[in-house]
């Protein structure tokens, strides 16, 4: 069937519309378009003869129409008057006619709307505001936006006049927002510019800051007042009821006790005509003196002396406070406070007691801190350490040893070789050493203040031949699946290569084996019983090589789940029951038995002569390894039958 489709159906003024023809018959002579719902020669727009491809305008032709060979009609620059029906008249070659009607609607392109308001400065909780969207346009829909969101649901918001007017009743400061209106019709949508609603409000009750109401004599008083208000409030200050100044801030330098009193801030809004006040009471206290700390011993000796720190001056009815390292006092038996907290005593001082220490005097409104005091604790010297840690050197190299001991004041150092004093320096340097430089090297550290001395002796061997190495271990009895073991090849020697063997083989590749410290240390992580092997380390340089004696790792493991033998579980009455329990374990485990939950004997073998059906039950073997701290057990059910009642039963032992 012949049909007409309007594309688009809703057309904007000034745009184009295409009346598209569907199902056009074959073998046509021509066709004609008419304005309206019927064929009317006076309302013919255009005709088209297919044979000549000639378009002929009719009485209703406006110069804006184009007819296509497929009978579709394009109308340009649409005007409001074009709205309505259009009829296509098709003339077939057999001169039989066919008609179809289509239609479209024309809408204006909407202008950009604007918002008018009946009240540009409404007062909070008093006024209403009516916004109207201009201009009034036929067939247009009106929408409103607040802060680019659709209108919230509120009993104070009312739409009227076909949604063209938005009324806000009893405006509040929260209605201060961006308002936009939008006009829509089927062909266009336009949004207005924002209108910001300026709601007059306040002043609210002012707030005075800071909230602090207690001050010390000599301080500056700086009060600030703020009240929510639109337009911003005008402020006035009153002290004890007397007007001071019309400012938002009140500043009084170097206050005295006489400045105590009631301070009032008044906020005024000239547009709303409202006033609000807030009062705060200020108290000014006399200034106490700044405390300081005295000490009965300025250079105490570690582990020997006590120190008493006293907070000065002494003031009656005053609370004294103490801080160490900017923290309140820790609980310690070495710290003692006097009854009035004024004196802090440190019993048997250590090097960690240096401080700083502060004391404080608490008054009505604050705490006054003393300057910090640091204790000069004399300590040491500790046992000196000689570095580097090498004990073996080759001839011809330089020997450079350094000594250090923790000490206050810093230690004075002396070096001795084989008991003979060499020099009073922290470092000892001997160039181009020979075998004759082998010997005992002693570093002596002396603290002149405490009078204490400490020494460390190191054996230095100078030899072209490497010594026989030895293996030291950090764990002689590691527990399986728990401990790690670090083997170290001694001694530490310069320019030396370290090698390792396990059971006479080079080290296997394993994620549990790790070499470190220039291959001098071999670490076994998460040891297993299979790691109980012979470990040998070797050292070599360009002229010699040597191997250590083997060290066998004693891995503690188990006990594993025990096994009860024999495996039989059925016995004849009168037989002997002889059960043996075994569990893999290092060291060997302790064994115990329970029959039907009742403890029996602490042996590996359980023997019961001439059993009867009364010996039926559960037989449990418990194993315990005191070294690993682990336990294990197994349960076996034993059935004893009366003689001759059941074939195939064990005769027992």
């Amino acid at each position: 069937k012949l049909t007409i489709e309007s594309t688009p159906f809703n057309v904007a003024e000034g745009k184009e519309v295409l009346l598209l023809v569907h199902n056009l018959p074959q073998h046509l002579f021509g066709y004609s378009w008419y304005k309206g719902e019927r064929v009317d020669g006076n309302r013919q727009i255009i005709g088209y003869v297919i044979g000549t491809q000639q378009a002929t305008p009719g009485p209703a032709y406006s110069g804006r129409e184009i007819i296509y060979p497929n009978a579709s009609l394009l109308i340009q620059n649409i005007i409001q008057n074009d709205t309505g029906f259009y009829t296509l008249h098709v003339i077939k070659s057999d001169l039989v006619n066919e008609e179809a009607t289509g239609q479209f609607r024309v809408y204006p392109e909407l202008p950009k709307p604007s918002i008018s308001s009946n009240n540009s400065k409404p007062v909070e909780d008093k006024d209403a505001v009516a916004f109207t969207c201009e201009p009034e346009t036929q067939d247009a829909t009106y929408l409103w936006w607040v802060n680019n969101q659709s209108l919230p649901v509120s009993p104070r918001l009312q739409l009227s006049n076909g949604n063209r007017t938005l009324t806000l009743f009893n405006v509040t400061r929260n209605d201060t927002a961006s308002y936009k209106c939008e006009t829509q019709n089927p062909v266009s949508a336009r949004r207005s510019d924002s209108v910001i609603l300026n709601v007059l409000y306040g002043p609210d009750a002012p707030t005075i800051s800071p909230l602090n109401t207690s001050y010390r004599s000599g301080e500056n008083l700086n009060l600030s007042c703020h009240a929510a208000s639109n337009p911003p409030a005008q402020y006035s200050w009153f002290v004890n009821g007397t007007f001071q100044q019309s400012t938002q801030e009140l500043f009084i330098p170097n206050i005295t006790v006489n400045n105590s009193g009631s301070y009032t801030c008044q906020a005024h809004n000239s547009d709303t005509g409202l006033n609000r006040t807030t009062v705060t009471t200020i108290t000014v206290y006399a200034e106490p003196p700044k405390p300081f700390i005295t000490s009965n011993n300025s250079n105490p000796v570690e582990d020997e002396d006590a120190v008493a720190l006293t907070c000065e001056p002494e003031i009656q009815n005053t609370t004294y406070l103490w801080w160490v390292n900017n923290q309140s006092l820790p609980v310690s038996p070495r710290l003692q406070l006097s009854n009035d907290n004024r004196t802090l005593t440190l019993l048997s001082v250590t090097r960690n007691d240096v401080g700083p220490y502060e004391c404080g005097i608490q008054n009505e409104l604050s705490v006054d801190h003393s300057d910090p005091v640091i204790l000069n604790v004399l300590y040491g010297p500790d046992d000196p350490t000689i570095s580097p840690s090498y004990t073996y050197y080759r001839p011809g190299v330089n020997l450079s040893l350094s000594c250090h001991a923790a000490s206050n004041p810093p230690a004075q150092y002396s070096w001795l070789i084989d008991g003979n004093i060499q020099q009073h320096t922290q470092e000892l340097f001997i160039s181009n050493i020979t075998e004759k430089n082998s010997g005992l090297y002693t570093c002596q550290a002396n603290n002149s203040a405490s009078g204490h001395s400490r020494t460390t002796v190191k054996t230095i061997t100078v030899s072209a031949e490497l010594p026989k190495p030895s293996i030291s271990s950090n764990n002689s009895k590691p527990v399986e699946d728990k401990d790690a073991v670090a083997f170290t090849c001694e001694p530490e020697a310069q320019n030396t290569t370290y090698l390792w063997w396990v059971n006479g083989q080079s080290l296997p590749v394993s994620p549990r084996l790790q070499l470190s410290n220039g291959n001098r240390t071999l670490t076994l992580f998460n040891v297993t019983r299979n790691d109980a092997r012979a470990y040998v380390c070797g050292i070599q340089n360009s002229v010699s090589a040597n191997r250590s004696d083997p060290v066998t790792l004693d891995v503690l493991y188990g006990p594993d789940t025990p096994i009860i033998s024999p495996p039989d579980s059925s016995y004849l009455s009168g037989a002997n029951l002889n059960l043996s329990c075994h569990s893999a374990s290092n060291p060997s485990p302790q064994y115990s038995w329970r029959i039907n939950g009742i403890p029996q004997q602490h042996t590996q073998v359980l023997f019961i002569a001439k059993i009867t059906p009364n010996n039926n039950g559960t037989y449990a073997c418990f194993v315990s390894n005191l070294a690993t701290g682990r336990n294990n057990s197994i349960v076996k059910s034993i059935t004893v039958s009366a003689s001759g009642t059941s074939p195939g039963l064990s005769a027992g032992a």
């Epitope: 804006r64 184009i66 394009l74 340009q76 620059n77």
Partner: nanobody, 119 residues
């Protein structure tokens, strides 16, 4: 009655210029698109230029771009085609037509005016 009357054709040497006029009656050219169509023997009809006053734009066939200029005087309800740098291949009968603003289609009327480019 709707009428389109073309004028301004004639004989011109290659490289020369001509100005064609299209006087419209029975409708306002400011409401539609006016185009110039040319027909030459053995060649396809070609819409060489169109002007849509109500849309504010003009368009040209690639073959005449930079040489032809279409314009309209709405007070006289007349459209013009200024033809410069004419070539022998521009020889044709030029018709004034109602053109589509959305494609290359048109309906034409009138007698047309002949343009001959020859030395």
């Amino acid at each position: 009655e709707v009428q389109l009357v073309e004028s301004g054709g004639g004989l011109v040497q290659p490289g020369g210029s001509l100005r064609l006029s299209c006087a419209a009656s029975g409708f306002n050219i400011k409401d539609t698109c006016i185009g110039w169509v040319r027909r030459a023997p053995g060649k396809e009809e070609e819409l060489v230029a169109a002007i849509c006053e109500y849309k504010g734009y003009t368009r040209y066939a690639d073959s005449v771009k930079g040489r032809f200029t279409i314009s309209a005087d709405t007070s006289k309800n007349t459209a013009y085609l200024q033809m410069n740098s004419l070539r022998a291949e521009d020889t044709a009968v030029y018709y004034c037509a109602i053109a589509s603003p959305v494609d290359q289609y048109y309906n034409y009327w009138g007698q047309g005016t002949t343009v001959t480019v020859s030395s």
